[in-house]
């Protein structure tokens, strides 16, 4: 059976939008007006994952691109990357763990915890135009809260 997916955009809690920065990186910056069209549209897929009270397992693909956010070790550090996949096989219900994020939602604020690396979160910097990354701290300088906006399919 096909996995269920919804199209959306994400903004961090400072209202920075996410845009492509080269072929395999996202960056966060404030956009306005016409420039909002630059923001990436995600296809959020609801996938299988470990049972947990307040966590919903999702995969985050880039709409109509065969790219998914994934979490891997690079130089012994959990790292966020955009990974190319075979579009014939993705998305699927049982995504490999590196593609799975636990969506934690409180009062319409979303966090995305790596399933592969617990307590590591999709993060943005306070500074403008910096890469989206996987951060190991919550509630510090870096931003781990996002809002989601639906996009028509």
């Amino acid at each position: 059976a096909p996995v269920r997916s919804l199209n959306c955009t994400l903004r961090d809690s400072q209202q920075k939008s996410l845009v492509m920065s080269g072929p395999y990186e996202l960056k966060a910056l404030h956009l306005q007006g016409q420039d909002m069209e630059q923001q990436v549209v995600f296809s959020m897929s609801f996938v299988q994952g470990e049972e947990s009270n307040d966590k919903i397992p999702v995969a985050l693909g880039l709409k109509e691109k065969n790219l998914y956010l994934s979490c891997v070790l690079k130089d012994d550090k959990p790292t966020l990357q955009l990974e190319s996949v075979d579009p014939k096989n993705y998305p699927k219900k049982k995504m490999e763990k590196r593609f799975v994020f636990n969506k934690i939602e409180i009062n319409n604020k979303l966090e995305f915890e790596s399933a592969q690396f617990p307590n590591w979160y999709i993060s943005t910097s306070q500074a403008e135009n910096m890469p989206v990354f996987l951060g190991g701290t919550k509630g510090g300088q870096d931003i781990t809260d996002f809002t989601m906006q639906f996009v028509s399919s």
């Epitope: 059976a1 269920r4 919804l6 199209n7 959306c8 609801f46 299988q48 049972e51 919903i56 999702v58 219900k93 969506k103 939602e105 319409n108 639906f150 996009v151 028509s152 399919s153």
Partner: antibody, heavy 120, light 106 residues
Framework: QVQLVQSGAEVKKPGSSVKVSCKAS????????IEWVRQAPGQGLEWMGE????????NYNEKFKGRVTITADKSTSTAYMELSSLRSEDTAVYYC?????????????WGQGTLVTVSS | DIQMTQSPSSLSASVGDRVTITCKAS??????LSWFQQKPKAPKSLIYR??RLVDGVPSRFSGSGSGTDFTLTISSLQPEDFATYYC?????????FGGGTKVEIK
């Protein structure tokens, strides 16, 4: 308070159409699927389709495709289910229900139901 | 379509009894199963994601299971619990319902 209030009972002739409404209140309409389910007298429950008002995404039960149209009006927080080419076997209670956009909470809230009677 | 086989179709029980209703799916439905209660008025949701209790539902109701086999338990039946209970899977389109279990007074 959080509720779904459906339109009143309808009596329809075979071949005609019926449009049932479901008005949501007390929650963010955009973020929940509105599900449509029916129950014919003495029969089981049958899922007809769903709409996510925030995105406009719609999923239909293949069994009803072509006969059912589900819409939503965000300005009034109201969802609609229209069933055409009615036949006697469409006589049923039609329910709306809500489900969070990420499918986590299941059919978490139900409307009171709308009885549609198809009779010549 | 996924078949949801619910049993028993009816049962008679007394106030204070422990009641168990089962639902078997024709294939794995992951965590996407809920239970609801139907009386003459609007259906009322009881359990979602197999075992999570809906806010405001008494703790005498509980859900368990995984994969294809699921159970709704009422630990101590109360007078207001006499009703019909349904399971529903929402893992795959079309969503499908069990046939219902009518809980009657013995």
């Amino acid at each position: 308070q959080v509720q779904l209030v459906q339109s009143g009972a309808e009596v329809k002739k075979p071949g005609s159409s019926v449009k049932v409404s479901c008005k949501a209140s007390g929650y963010t309409f955009d973020r929940y699927w509105i599900e449509w389910v029916r129950q014919a007298p003495g029969q089981g429950l049958e899922w007809m389709g769903e709409i996510l008002p925030g995105s406009g995404d719609i999923n239909y039960n293949e069994k009803f495709k072509g006969r059912v149209t589900i819409t939503a009006d965000k300005s009034t927080s109201t969802a609609y289910m229209e069933l055409s080419s009615l036949r006697s076997e469409d006589t049923a209670v039609y329910y709306c229900a809500r489900m969070y956009y990420d499918y986590d909470q299941g059919f978490s809230l139900w409307g009171q139901g709308t009885l549609v009677t198809v009779s010549s | 379509d996924i078949q949801m086989t619910q049993s028993p179709s009816s049962l008679s029980a007394s106030v204070g009894d422990r009641v168990t209703i089962t639902c078997k799916a024709s294939q794995d439905i992951d965590r996407f199963l809920s239970w609801f209660q139907q009386k003459p008025k609007a259906p009322k949701s009881l359990i979602y994601r197999v075992k999570r209790l809906v806010d405001g539902v008494p703790s005498r109701f509980s859900g368990s299971g995984s994969g294809t086999d699921f159970t709704l338990t009422i630990s101590s039946l109360q007078p207001e619990d006499f009703a019909t209970y349904y399971c529903v899977q929402y893992d795959e389109f079309p969503y499908t319902f069990g046939g219902g279990t009518k809980v009657e007074i013995k």
